[in-house]
């Protein structure tokens, strides 16, 4: 069913990292335009990206209202230049997305090592607490603010002169590790949400090594 000469969207896909969330779909439109609606299970559908020829729609502003809710989006197809036209059933053609729960499914972005500081045989490594687009009381929350203790970081570290890696974990954004005096070490971190069943881990951060500008050394 549906409007003559329009085709339904397909391959509706959520692309989400640190709650920045975009819905993508196919096909590239030929003589048609799209409007997207999004809703929680309440069925209070909100329209976005009106009559667009794009095949993506940024839904971040909607999902950050409550990242624990489960969302569904639907993409309506209309004939270009005649968006009031409907199909034989009096309904425009549409397709539903998969369900999407941001808290459980948004990808964890690549973390960044903010700094490291050596004091004797200990090194304190700090992970940057990235800001998200989730708001509370008119302020943007950090990744740690949103996930709390559900979010851990894994530190991989190794002597610059060898390849044997060690690991450490923290449920804050800081590590305090023991190192051999006089040795330079390299570091990489990964964000992990162990309780998740999908998208549990981020990609590894860029490697940072002692003796470079991010570090500080004190006896």
């Amino acid at each position: 069913s549906g409007t003559t000469n329009t085709v339904a969207a397909y391959n509706l896909t959520w692309k989400s990292t640190n709650f920045k969330t975009i819905l993508e779909w196919e096909p590239k439109p030929v003589n048609q335009v799209y409007t997207v609606q999004i809703s929680t299970k309440s069925g209070d559908w909100k329209s976005k990206c009106f009559y667009t020829t794009d095949t993506e729609c940024d839904l971040t502003d909607e999902i950050v209202k409550d990242v624990n809710q489960t969302y569904l989006a639907r993409v309506f197809s209309y004939p270009a230049g005649n968006v009031e036209s409907t199909g034989s059933a009096g309904e425009p053609l549409y397709e539903n997305s998969p369900e999407f729960t941001p808290y459980l499914e948004t990808n964890l972005g690549q973390p960044t090592i903010q700094s490291f500081e050596q004091v004797g045989t200990k090194v304190n490594v700090t992970v940057e607490d990235e800001r998200t687009l989730v708001r509370r009381n008119n302020t943007f929350l950090s990744l740690r603010d949103v996930f709390g203790k559900d979010l851990i970081y894994t530190l991989y570290y190794w002597k610059s002169s060898s390849s044997g890696k060690k690991t450490a974990k923290t449920n804050t954004n800081e590590f305090l590790i023991d190192v051999d005096k006089g040795e330079n070490y390299c570091f990489s971190v990964q964000a992990v949400i162990p309780s998740r069943t999908v998208n549990r881990k981020s990609t590894d951060s860029p490697v940072e090594c002692m003796g470079q500008e991010k570090g500080e050394f004190r006896e």
Epitope: S1, S42, G43, D44, Q69
Partner: antibody, heavy 118, light 107 residues
Framework: EVQLLESGGGLVQPGGSLRLSCAAS????????MSWVRQAPGKGLEWVSS????????YYTDSVKGRFTISRDNSKNTLYLQMNSLRAEDTAVYYC???????????WGQGTLVTVSS | DIQMTQSPPSLSASAGDRVTITCRAS??????LAWYQQKPEKAPKSLIY???SLQSGVPSRFSGSGSGTDFTLTISSLQPEDFATYYC?????????FGQGTKLEIK
């Protein structure tokens, strides 16, 4: 555990009115669309009406438009169906159901019988 | 309105049998279809939504398939508690409509 408990059914004369209630518990009521579905004796299921979580959007089957009104009180976790100008063909068990996105019906009450007869 | 036609209207089978019930929509509804089970004097129970997604708590012997206009509900190995009436429902567009039901009886 999701629980839906209908009440307000009974015997009413043609042309009369009745108000059904559905008390919800075990979930965040305002987060879900809700629906009424009915089943005439010995017959199949018929969707009657749906309402969004905010109450801003309501939908009805053609045969009850203008006679039935669906509403909800989220502060009381209660769904309502005001039925006016009742007809013999409205006789049925009326079920309240939770309706994610206003789509399918994932949890149902036990039903309340409405009999329209003189 | 979209008409939903179920077949067969009734079906006799034995415990352990594999059973398939079909539902046809009068126009395309993509995957916007649900299946319900109802036992005598009881409220319906949700089995399947989005044509093939199993409702939480429903045994895996139940499965759904199809898209567009033709859909099936399959019970891979009938259990005694599965004898009931089954309904399909489209939620593509209002008014939502149900099939007339398929009564599954013990042979």
């Amino acid at each position: 555990e999701v629980q839906l408990l209908e009440s307000g059914g009974g015997l009413v004369q043609p042309g009369g009115s009745l108000r059904l209630s559905c008390a919800a518990s075990g979930f965040t009521f305002s987060n879900y669309a809700m629906s009424w579905v009915r089943q005439a004796p010995g017959k199949g299921l018929e969707w009657v009406s749906s309402i969004s979580g905010s109450g801003d959007y309501t939908y009805y089957t053609d045969s009850v438009k203008g006679r039935f009104t669906i509403s909800r009180d989220n502060s009381k976790n209660t769904l309502y169906l005001q039925m006016n100008s009742l007809r013999a063909e409205d006789t049925a068990v009326y079920y309240c159901a939770r309706s994610p996105w206003g789509y399918y019906l994932d949890s149902w009450g036990q039903g309340t019988l409405v009999t329209v007869s003189s | 309105d979209i008409q939903m036609t179920q077949s067969p209207p009734s079906l006799s089978a034995s415990a352990g049998d594999r059973v398939t019930i079909t539902c046809r929509a009068s126009q395309g509804i993509s995957s916007r279809l649900a299946w319900y089970q109802q036992k005598p004097e009881k409220a319906p129970k949700s089995l399947i939504y989005a044509a093939s997604s199993l409702q939480s708590g429903v045994p895996s012997r139940f499965s759904g398939s199809g898209s567009g206009t033709d859909f099936t509900l399959t019970i891979s190995s009938l259990q005694p508690e599965d004898f009931a009436t089954y309904y399909c429902q489209q939620y593509n567009s209002y008014p939502y409509t149900f099939g007339q039901g398929t009564k599954l009886e013990i042979k």
